[in-house]
Interface confidence: low
């Protein structure tokens, strides 16, 4: 198996190849980047920037009706999310749903074999602790840049502010406080899939300080799943400085979004499962992580698993063969989206509808079976890819057929016996789906019999013959008569006609040769006759 | 099915040029992503370039160095390489990959192309 390229590969082209081994549902996928807010508590109001993507997809391919004229897989995904600061009290790391994500950008694309789907860079939001009793500030989250890039926007806390005011009023310059500056800020997470790890950016602010380093020094090679709290963070135009928290999120890595549609179902059903690979639960809280996965035009269909992720299947059934459907499937880190993916699965072919047939009028050996042209009905039934015709008298023949084919003349059949000609119509999608079996029935005509089987003469006295023998192998008709014809030189002597193939021939001549001749007569037909020599004695008396 | 038919390669001094090309037939393959791929002895095989829907990407490595291009009338995918380096030296494949409307997709690989570039 070749390995997936690293997220480092270059951000302001597209993504690359991933080369898989075994092929998986391959699905035009559109990844939306999230562009939503994280609310929290005593929130009350919520941002929304234009999302950008930035996860690497695999193999881009064309997709009709796409929004963009080309398909950008590596840029960086933005998303902010706003958040108060709650008074006094630190705040949790909690966020709502988020809304829905506006400005949208279709990025079409096919998914790997295996890994499944791509996903979508995740974008995440940090919450901070507040510890100003005074007033509450706007604070934002960050977004992943490069390979995966998440964007959240943290809340600050404030630095305490002396509360008493001076008996003077003293016109000064003051620096902007540092909770103004960094309330809104957005960071940009940057995911390293090589070493699994996360850089973060403070996005717009020159020269940030994290304590007395400098934050492009310390916000980098940051664990996934991590959390780093009450970060002093504040830079030479603000004081006094600032405090944030980081969430770190999962790598987008993890998730990959797989068909679980069994083929025999995948006509009307279709089973998606976001699955984790590599995620250390230990260090991730499955509590901070959720999916919510849904198909289009099913409305009220979702499958939702919130604040606990445990990978299981979501299966729509009931869907109409060979039809579009957009499925959403959206996995959220602490509420906010951190993979979001839309992709079009088209459900499988339909069973065909397969025609009557009709068996004609058949000779003694063969028949023409034809059925009309199949009607094309693709709200339900999908057109033949081919028939399988079959027909039994004991035992039972199939012959394929291709779907150009209306008529088959069905040969070497037994003459005057009853058939059953069963005709399906069958498609090729991902398994071969049958049709129901139409049928017909017919009845051969008679054919000449066999001989018959075993014949034997013997004498019983002097001057008379027993003649006996079996049935044809085949007597290819309705009826059985046996008929025994006595010949001597050359010469018509008698005649029998019995049901049964036991003659008694006497009163002959003495000493006489006799031809004795039979054949079997099946109502309609008389076939070949066995002729076997036998001679009378003299007369002992 | 999808035949991959790599041709260029071969020995080079550094610095020098080189390009490869790999022919598509037995499918129209329009709607494809084609991309070429490496593997230096030892190594795993790992991503140069890629082209989908007139979109380009390169690995850092090659950047600015080589050029993937698609000739969608012919169906042929090219890369020219400039200023070659031994460390480009790999056996080369060609990778084509489609999406079917009933949701699989499939992968196809070139026979592979030598390119040795060694003083």
């Known amino acids: 198996q070749t390995p997936t390229p690293s997220d480092e590969l270059s951000t302001t082209e597209n993504a690359l190849l991933l080369p898989q081994s075994d092929p998986l549902p391959a699905r035009t996928t559109e990844s939306t980047p999230p562009s939503i807010s994280e609310r929290g508590n005593g929130s009350s109001e919520t941002t929304y920037h234009p999302g950008v993507l930035s996860t690497l997809l695999p193999h881009l391919s064309p997709q009709p009706d796409s929004q963009t004229p080309s398909a950008g897989g590596a840029d960086t995904q933005t998303f902010s999310s706003q958040a108060d600061n709650p008074t006094l009290t630190p705040a949790p790391g909690g966020g709502t749903d988020p809304p829905g994500v506006p400005g949208e950008r279709t990025v079409p694309g096919t998914i790997p074999a295996d890994t499944a789907f791509p996903v979508d860079t995740p974008s995440l939001a940090r919450n901070s602790s507040a510890a100003s009793p005074t007033h509450t500030s706007n604070v934002s989250t960050t977004d992943i840049s490069s390979g995966a890039s998440l964007t959240t926007l943290t809340p600050s806390t404030l630095g305490l502010a002396s509360t008493d005011p001076p008996s003077t009023t003293i016109a000064t310059t003051t620096k902007q406080t540092c909770a103004a500056m960094f309330g809104n800020i957005t960071v940009n997470y940057t995911y390293e899939s090589s070493n699994q790890t996360f850089k973060a950016d403070l996005k717009d602010v020159q020269n940030a300080k994290c304590g007395n380093e400098d934050c492009e020094n310390v916000l980098n090679n940051l664990e996934e799943c991590s959390q780093i709290k009450n970060i002093s963070v504040s830079n030479d135009s603000c004081a006094p400085a600032t405090t944030i928290d980081l969430y770190v999120p999962p790598g987008t890595d993890k998730f990959s979004l797989h068909d679980c549609t069994p083929k025999e179902k995948a006509n009307t059903s279709i089973c998606l499962e976001w699955k984790t690979k590599n995620l250390d639960f230990r260090k991730c809280n499955s509590d901070n992580i959720s999916y919510v996965l849904h198909c289009e035009p099913e409305n009220n269909t979702k499958c939702i698993r919130r604040n606990t992720f445990i990978p299981e299947r979501c299966q729509l059934d009931n869907l109409r063969a060979q039809t579009n459907y957009t499925c959403v499937a959206e996995i959220l880190y602490r509420g906010v989206k951190l993979v979001k993916n839309v992709i079009n699965v088209q459900t499988d072919l339909g069973i065909p509808e397969t025609p009557k047939p009709s068996c004609g009028d058949p000779a003694a050996r063969k028949t023409l079976v034809s059925w009309p042209e199949p009607v094309s009905k693709p709200e339900s039934a999908s057109k033949p890819h081919g028939y399988v015709l079959c027909y039994k008298n004991n035992s039972e023949k199939c012959k394929s057929l291709p779907n150009n084919v209306t008529s088959f003349e069905v040969e070497s059949l037994k003459p005057y016996k009853y058939y059953e000609v069963s005709l399906l119509a069958y498609v090729n999608g991902k398994i071969q789906r049958n049709g129901t079996a139409e049928k017909c029935n017919f009845h051969t005509k008679a054919d000449r019999p066999d001989k018959v089987n075993g014949m034997k003469t013997s004498r019983p006295t002097d001057n008379s013959i027993n003649v006996t023998c079996g049935p044809p192998y085949e007597t290819n008709g309705p009826k059985t008569f046996y008929i025994l014809v006595v010949r001597s030189g050359g010469s018509f002597v008698t005649k029998y006609n019995k049901t049964n193939c036991q003659f008694y021939v006497d009163n002959l001549y003495y000493s006489t040769d006799y031809e004795f001749l039979v054949s079997f007569h099946n109502g309609v037909y008389e076939g070949d006759s066995v002729i076997r020599n036998e001679s009378t004695n003299f007369n002992a008396k | 099915q999808v035949q991959l038919v790599q041709s260029g390669g071969g020995l080079v001094q550094p610095g020098g040029s080189l390009r490869l090309s790999c022919a598509a037939s037995?499918?129209?393959?329009?709607?494809?992503?084609m991309g070429w791929y490496r593997q230096a002895p030892g190594s795993q095989r790992e991503l140069v370039a890629s082209?989908?829907?007139?979109?380009?990407s390169y690995a850092d490595a090659v950047k600015g160095r080589f050029t993937i291009s698609r000739d969608y009338a012919k169906n042929i995918i090219y890369l020219q390489m400039n200023s070659l380096k031994p460390d480009d030296t790999a056996v080369y494949f060609c990778?084509?990959?489609?999406?079917?409307?009933?949701?699989?997709?499939?992968?196809?690989w070139g026979q592979g192309t030598q390119v040795t570039v060694s003083g």
């Open positions: 990778n084509y990959r489609t999406t079917y409307t009933s949701g699989y997709s499939e992968d196809y």
């Open positions: 037995g499918r129209a393959f329009n709607s494809a992503a």
């Open positions: 082209i989908s829907a007139g979109t380009a």
